[in-house]
């Protein structure tokens, strides 16, 4: 084994290096000292380190470690943050388009419904957006509310456009009749199925991305223990105390120290792997009725079909509803 | 006799977007993200090695520091002696993860469970027999998916309608819905967000 080189007789090199860490030289001994008060860089002979220097090295070592960890995760963190933002914006744009397609369908096919239809469609898609962002809204309730709100307007503006204003007083009855008589056929149920499946998947996808960011942020800002700080100091800085400024830690030694410092963090590994594989599985299934883009952008068409269904059965419905909601008008058709 | 308007507004002509060479859809973007994420699948197990390779470590030098003394790089002491003599091993004993790490592990367990629950079983993208009561004529069949965008020739099947490089910007305002003869044209200013 090679003999250790003699310590710098004046601690000059150590002093100039330490000055970069801590301006002001009062902590560096002029010449090597016994160092009996040292707790980390335990000397085998005279040393150029003091207790205060050791504390400063520990602080610097932990800061270095935090910076290394942050730079290690920078690319991954950026990847998830950027994609979470992109997908959230894209989903909002899909919702906005879906709303506009639906409004356009009403404006061009059922202009007499538009003032109210725009309002109901707007409320529905606002709920869709809130649901995707994690709000505690029931999708079936959203769809039911849309059709419950639309039917009285369809009845009074489309099926019987010239009813007296008193017909508006039976809105509650019409809302009830909508479900009892299944006036839109199975279309509401169809929309519930498609919308709930596609939105659930979209919502969990966004939640997963946001959790990914949280995982990286957590490990990114870990505060390392004192034990770890001592290990890092010993590895990176104790050599300086002996005047060995240019020497580097051994590779195997570094790995052992890092595994010691990161024992807790590495425990995430198993769940992180599972997270990525589960997310991949989810993404592979996001098509057709599990793809909100596909479902929401096709909603205008299904809603249009549902209204045509009502119109097709208008005669039967009007008679039944006339009895069910028996409002005072004597209806005289020719 | 009832009259039904035949000039259904939203049809293939109006919503069709000019062909784009690079058609980047949401689903392709999702798959691309997964591929990139998979390259980080070993991120946490590889962290110690990554940090060592990005901090000063003796690579080409003959001598290296083992925490206590200068040793030859390939000697047993390079990894072991300094550790044994100075770490008293209590510093390395497993202390269990910090509370914040334990918390994040719990959250990962939870999301993983949710992701597994939500994942579509292979070969079963559609739920059959949505409703035992049959639709009346003109309604959709058992495949509820077939109903998407279905309304004869007047309607379009919406398939990956939103294209990042073309259609994200087609932001139809209710006040100026295009008429039947208008082509939906994208506006460039809304597209840049989605370039890598």
């Amino acid at each position: 084994q090679p003999p250790p080189p003699p310590p710098d007789a004046t601690c000059h090199q150590v002093r100039s290096f330490f000055q970069r860490l801590q301006p002001g030289l009062k902590w560096v001994p002029e010449t090597p000292v016994p160092g009996s008060d040292l707790q980390v860089c335990l000397p085998k002979g005279p040393t150029c380190c003091s207790r205060k220097m050791e504390e400063k090295y520990q602080l610097t070592a932990r800061l270095n470690m935090e910076q290394l960890l942050q730079s290690a995760s920078m690319e991954l963190k950026f990847l998830i943050i950027q994609n979470a933002a992109v997908f959230q914006e894209a989903f909002e744009i899909v919702v906005r388009h879906a709303k506009n397609y639906t409004n356009a369908m009403f404006k061009n096919n059922y202009p007499s419904l538009t003032p109210q239809a725009f309002e109901f469609v707007g409320e529905f898609f606002t709920d869709v957006s809130l649901y995707i962002l994690g709000s505690d809204i029931n999708v079936d309730d959203m769809v039911n509310e849309l059709f419950d709100s639309l039917f009285p307007v369809i009845y009074t503006q489309l099926m019987n456009p010239g009813l007296p204003d008193s017909a508006l007083d039976i809105n509650e009855c019409l809302r009830g009749a909508r479900r009892d008589l299944k006036v839109f056929g199975n279309f509401p149920k169809l929309i519930m199925t498609q919308v709930s499946k596609s939105l659930q998947v979209t919502r969990i996808f966004l939640q997963a991305l946001n959790l990914g960011i949280e995982v990286i942020n957590t490990t990114d800002h870990l505060k390392f223990s004192k034990d770890c700080g001592r290990m890092l100091t010993r590895m990176w800085y104790c050599s300086y105390c002996q005047g060995l400024m240019m020497v580097k830690p051994c590779g195997g030694y570094c790995n052992v120290v890092m595994q010691g410092c990161m024992a807790g963090v590495v425990e995430i590994d198993k769940y992180w792997r599972e997270y990525i594989l589960s997310l991949e599985e989810l993404v592979n299934g996001m098509y057709r009725i599990y793809d909100m883009e596909n479902v929401l952008l096709g909603l205008f068409s299904t809603i249009h079909d549902s209204i045509q269904y009502v119109q097709k059965n208008a005669g039967k419905l009007t008679t039944t509803i006339g009895k069910l909601c028996a409002h005072s008008q004597q209806r005289q058709y020719r | 006799s009832a009259y039904y308007p035949e000039d259904l507004f939203i049809d293939k002509k109006v919503l069709k977007v000019a062909h784009v060479e690079h058609e980047e859809t949401l689903s392709s973007r999702r798959r691309e993200l997964i591929q990139k994420l998979k390259s980080f699948i070993s991120f946490y197990s590889a962290l110690p090695g990554y940090i060592c390779s990005h901090s000063p470590v003796a690579e080409n030098d003959t001598l290296c520091w083992n925490g206590q003394e200068l040793v030859e790089r390939y000697s047993q002491k390079a990894a072991r002696n300094g550790m044994k003599n100075q770490f008293n091993l209590h510093e390395l004993k497993m202390k269990g993860p910090e509370p914040v790490v334990s918390q994040i592990i719990d959250k990962l367990k939870h999301i993983n469970q949710l992701l597994r629950t939500m994942s579509v079983p292979k070969g079963r993208v559609l739920d059959k027999n949505l409703d035992e009561e049959g639709f009346e004529s003109g309604d959709c069949g058992d495949d509820e998916d077939e109903c998407i965008g279905g309304s004869g020739d007047g309607m379009m099947k919406v398939k990956n309608q939103l294209r990042f490089l073309a259609e994200l910007a087609y932001d139809l305002d209710v006040d100026d819905v295009p008429g039947n003869n208008q082509q939906a044209t994208p506006k460039d200013n809304e597209i840049s967000t989605f370039h890598n």
């Epitope: 009074t156 010239g162 007296p164 008008q329 | -």
Partner: antibody, heavy 120, light 107 residues
Framework: QVQLHQSGAEMAKPGASVNLSCKTS????????ISWVKQRTRQGLEWIGD????????YYNEKFKDKATLTADRSSSTAYMELRSMTSEDSAVYFC?????????????WGQGTSLTVSS | DILLTQSPAILSVSPGERVSFSCRAS??????IHWYQQRTNGSPRLLIK???ESISGIPSRFGGSGSRTDFTLTINSVESEDIADYYC?????????FGGGTKLEIK
């Protein structure tokens, strides 16, 4: 701009029938209803009935249901009212007016009126 | 049928004065009342719809108020061109009915 143009003055004999027309322009005919209103000399206004051309929904005032028949021709955006079995009581000015749908039912545009005189 | 009673039958005011027309319904009709002006030998013209909603193109001096059974049309500052008959109409229930009208004269 919205216009409702009614056919010219009519003379009819008791027991005969007449057909009054109301040609519209400046709006989508099928999005509104057309109301018919009667006004006898120096008297008030009486609602006869409404027709909604899109689905041909027709509503009559009970009092006129055996007197008037409302029709509409979507191709020419014209509404018609046939009055039958004329008596002197039917001598009046008849107005057509545009009507919104339920909850929007004011008569916002009116024709110039058609004067009908029943005399033997 | 819902009966609409307008009072008085004739109103005589000086230019610049504020004038109010009354219309009373025989049963509650919410706000389903509309006001029309008919000048001599002319067609009726919509002034106010649904009790108080203004109509574009109608001077702002015309205003409406009321609900259920009692309704009022107000002209804030009468002008000579306002000489006409004024009718209220209900669209709450069939058959739609008009009031008997109020004649506005200028002193």
């Amino acid at each position: 701009q919205v216009q409702l143009h009614q056919s010219g003055a009519e003379m009819a004999k008791p027991g005969a029938s007449v057909n009054l027309s109301c040609k519209t322009s400046g709006f989508t005919f099928t999005d509104y209803g057309i109301s018919w209103v009667k006004q006898r000399t120096r008297q008030g206004l009486e609602w006869i009935g409404d027709i909604y051309p899109r689905h041909i929904n027709i509503y009559y005032n009970e009092k006129f249901k055996d007197k008037a028949t409302l029709t509409a021709d979507r191709s020419s955006s014209t509404a018609y009212m046939e009055l039958r079995s004329m008596t002197s009581e039917d001598s009046a000015v008849y107005f057509c007016a545009r009507r919104g749908t339920t909850g929007r039912g004011a008569l916002d545009y009116w024709g110039q009126g058609t004067s009908l005189t029943v005399s033997s | 049928d819902i009966l609409l009673t307008q009072s008085p039958a004739i109103l005589s005011v000086s230019p610049g004065e504020r004038v109010s027309f009354s219309c009373r319904a025989s049963q509650s009709i919410g706000t389903s009342i509309h006001w029309y002006q008919q000048r001599t030998n002319g067609s009726p013209r919509l002034l106010i719809k649904y009790a108080f909603e203004s109509i574009s193109g109608i001077p702002s001096r015309f205003g409406g108020s009321g609900s259920r059974t009692d309704f009022t049309l107000t002209i804030n500052s009468v002008e000579s061109e306002d000489i006409a008959d004024y009718y209220c109409q209900q669209t709450y229930n069939w058959p739609y009915t008009f009031g008997g009208g109020t004649k506005l004269e200028i002193k």
